[in-house]
Interface confidence: low
């Protein structure tokens, strides 16, 4: 019988404690906000926001400029000064709660916690492969804004999501803000509303519309903005929020809101309840039928899937996906199963789902006792009635107000319970090659590069590595710019390859030869590694 | 400061087609939609429609019957209310009105034009 | 449609006095969304375009003069004029923008005793 050599154990051919330093930057505070830009002519840069404070960074990670974005009231505020003499409100720090690009200007805006939750639009001006930021412009009028009615009060001190779409020459901000009692009644900004930035940039267009949480609610009912994106014809939120307004407003669930990216109307807005499960291959005894809910979004993503991972999920190759990861409750504290969870929403099912729901609404003969939902926003109805009345008037259409439609929709865990006791705080999602691969930030501070597969009983690391010595939690929001990815942890911004930040963590030549080809690794006489690692002995033909 | 002109008197026969235009200055056209309103000789007001004219977009008042067609040209600022198959009892005057405009379809009207008085007879 | 139903039909005072005019609605006009009532009034003088008093039912529009107040919640509502000028006698008319179509009262007309 011939003698074979003995089978390394698969995680015994890779060490995560291998440490690897990836290019940082010390932004002097917590990071509150970070958003990239990439020009037509090859300037890009990295925008940080901390409490007082913008910084612009070039691609390298390097200061460019600094801006002073508070304390309101202070002398030294930069942006407040664009505002003209004050006061302008009570004095006060300067969070940022919300900075986009503009990309049609293109500009950077940033809205902050201070001054009613006004913002500053900075138009961009290349320099070299830098950028830098122009003098502000206040996006208030104040001659348009009253407290119960303020166009230009965008950002809620509770948080706020912004998209930014172009429709024709203009720009409209797809605004969701988290409300209480407090922040509704001081120049009150809307839970979901759609504004236009004035040419002039003197601020935002006054009627525009919005949907709040009403007054009798705002103690009880409370949203929280998880993450917003545009695709297609259509703006999506992901929203935690109380399952009912009636019953204990801790039982939480997910839900996405869709309103058109075409028409800045409310009239088409839908909701639909995101269902993510963890359903363990082999059920142990009084486990829940269908698998365990994991009810309440931590972070989430959409992108176009990898080959493999669209077969997996019965779609075409490049069609958008929304990932998200999921938690048991609030604290995302141990329970039985995993602490995470992944799970994946084809945006075309979703559409879907939410047309079909429209048609049970409208269409007849509709289901007696089906209700259009959204109790918090609006008066209770029944479908097909709009909202607080008993009947459709002939020149009303059922489809002209907003609707919760009455199904949700039902995944489960992509990594078969396999992220264990990992808990994920940040998510981006990118196609390399055919392979999908999930970019996660950690609770402690790690990085976790994965590639989304359903099928397997182990996790396809790219990698698995610490940013730094901090342990801080990664941030959820993460930018791209060009090939890497920026993280943000503590006070540090990082910057991480999107192909993995080298191959050394592979410790057999074998498993160092398998690694995905966009990882660029190969053997180098003792360790795996990238060829201008060693240049001399690197190949990636065969194993000695 | 914000201005509604409408323009000057008409003379029509039944069966015919009138076109009354309200040019806007003082304000951003697409900021606001515009509505147009009937007063009959000694009578009250009557709601004819509205536009936006962001996207163009009319809501007829049914009573009107489809007679009533709502334009926006928004290269000059000028909204247009055209109403068809003319009778005597459509001599009246007719205003346009920018409204403010909300979610529920809230809309008041804070600017007037000064009225086109259209006349119908034999 | 909501139909807008105004009294008197013609108010006889003499300036100096307080008015008060009524508008009833066939459906509530408080709309839950916000808690404001959809309620628009306006007056009317001989040969001019209407004019914008009060909005939301309350909220004086901009060059209004204080002597001028709205009030009311759901179908029932009052402008007042607590001390009637000489040019306040005109035609009032009260506007609903709940819902399409929008719909004016047939008016009160404000005459001098």
């Known amino acids: 019988e011939d003698w074979q050599c003995p089978r390394t154990p698969y995680a015994a051919s890779r060490d995560f404690d291998v440490k690897y330093v990836v290019p940082s930057f010390s932004a002097g505070g917590l990071v509150q906000a970070m958003v990239t830009y990439e020009g037509d002519r090859n300037e890009s840069a990295v925008f940080v926001a901390i409490r007082n404070r913008l910084h612009v960074l070039g691609p390298d990670l390097k200061s460019v400029q600094s801006l002073a974005t508070g304390p309101a009231g202070d002398p030294g505020c930069q942006t407040c000064a664009a505002c003209g003499p004050g006061p302008h409100g009570p004095p006060g720090d300067t969070d940022t709660k919300v900075l986009v690009l503009d990309p049609a200007l293109p500009a950077l805006v940033s809205c902050g916690s201070s001054l009613q939750g006004r913002c500053f639009l900075h138009d961009l001006e290349p320099q070299g492969t830098a950028v830098h930021l122009a003098a502000p412009a206040c996006l208030f009028s104040a001659h348009h804004n009253r407290p119960d009615d303020c166009p230009d009060c965008v950002a809620s001190p509770l948080g706020t999501r912004v998209t930014v779409v172009e429709q024709g020459q203009a720009s409209y901000f797809y605004v969701a803000s988290s409300l209480d009692a407090a922040v509704a009644a001081s120049f009150s900004p809307r839970s979901v509303s759609i504004r236009r930035l004035k040419a002039d940039a003197s601020g935002f267009a006054p009627g525009f519309v919005a949907l709040s949480v009403l007054p009798k609610h705002l103690v009880s009912y409370s949203i929280e903005y998880v993450h917003s994106f545009h695709t297609g014809a259509f703006v999506y939120f992901l929203t935690v929020q109380p399952a009912s307004v009636t019953d204990d407003p801790s039982a939480l669930h997910t839900r996405l809101a869709r309103l058109s990216a075409t028409e800045p109307e409310l009239g088409d807005y839908r909701e639909l309840v995101l269902d993510c499960r963890f359903a363990p291959k082999r059920r142990r005894r009084g486990a829940p039928e269908g698998g365990q809910p994991y009810p309440v979004l931590r972070v989430a993503h959409s992108a176009p899937v990898g080959a493999q991972l669209a077969t997996e999920l019965s779609i075409a190759e490049g069609q958008e996906v929304l990932f998200g990861v999921f938690v048991t409750g609030k604290d995302g504290g141990p329970g039985v199963g995993p602490n995470s969870v992944v799970c994946a929403f084809p945006i075309d099912l979703l559409d879907t789902l939410i047309d079909e729901g429209v048609e049970r609404c409208c269409e007849s003969p509709v289901h007696p006792g089906l209700r259009r939902g959204l109790d918090f926003f609006q008066s209770p109805s029944f479908c097909p009635n709009p909202p607080g009345l008993e009947a459709l008037s002939p020149n009303t259409s059922c489809r002209h107000f907003p609707l919760l439609v009455s199904s949700s929709f039902s995944r489960v865990d992509l990594f078969n319970g396999l992220l264990g006791p990992v808990q994920v705080t940040a998510l981006y999602v990118t196609r390399l090659d055919n392979v999908t691969v999930a970019h996660m930030g950690t609770m402690d501070g790690r990085i976790l590069q994965v590639e989304l597969v359903r099928s397997l009983n182990y996790l396809l690391y790219v990698s698995n590595f610490s940013l730094g010595d901090s342990g801080q939690p990664v941030q959820r929001d993460v930018s791209r710019l060009g090939d890497h990815l920026l993280f943000a942890s503590g006070d540090q911004v990082f910057q991480v390859p999107i192909q993995g930040p080298g191959c050394r963590h592979f410790l057999t030549c074998g498993r160092c030869l398998r690694a995905w080809h966009f990882m660029g690794c190969g053997w180098c006489g003792n360790m795996c590694g990238q060829q201008k690692e060693c240049p001399g002995s690197w190949q990636q033909d065969h194993c000695p | 400061q914000v201005q509604l002109v409408q323009s000057g008197a008409e003379v029509k026969k039944p069966g015919a087609t009138v076109k009354i235009s309200c040019k806007v200055s003082g304000y951003t056209f697409t900021d606001y939609h515009m509505d147009w309103v009937q007063q009959a000789p000694g009578k009250g007001l009557e709601w004819m429609g509205d536009i936006n004219p962001n996207n163009g977009g009319a809501i007829y008042n049914q009573k009107f019957k489809g007679r009533v067609t709502i334009t926006a040209d928004t290269s000059t600022d000028t909204a247009y209310m055209e109403l068809s198959s003319l009778r005597s009892e459509d001599t009246a005057v007719y205003y346009c009105?920018?409204?403010?405009?909300?979610?529920?379809?809230?809309?008041?009207?804070?600017?007037w034009g000064q009225g086109t008085l259209v006349t119908v007879s034999r | 449609e909501i139909v807008m139903t105004q009294s008197p039909g013609t108010l006889s005072l003499s300036p100096g006095e307080r008015a008060t005019l009524s508008c009833k609605s066939s459906q509530s006009l408080l709309f839950s969304g916000n808690q404001k009532n959809y309620l628009a009034w306006y007056q009317q003088k001989p040969g001019q375009a209407p004019r914008l008093l009060i909005y939301?039912?309350?909220t004086r529009a901009s060059g209004i003069p204080d002597r001028f107040s709205g009030s009311g919640s759901g179908t029932d509502f009052t402008l007042t004029i607590s001390r009637l000028e000489p040019e306040d006698f005109a035609v009032y008319y009260c506007?609903?923008?709940?819902?399409?179509?929008?719909?004016f009262g047939q008016g009160t007309k404000l005459e001098i005793k």
């Open positions: 939301w039912a309350s």
């Open positions: 506007q609903q923008y709940y819902s399409f179509p929008r719909t």
């Open positions: 009105a920018r409204s403010h405009y909300d979610y529920a379809g809230g809309a008041w009207f804070a600017y």
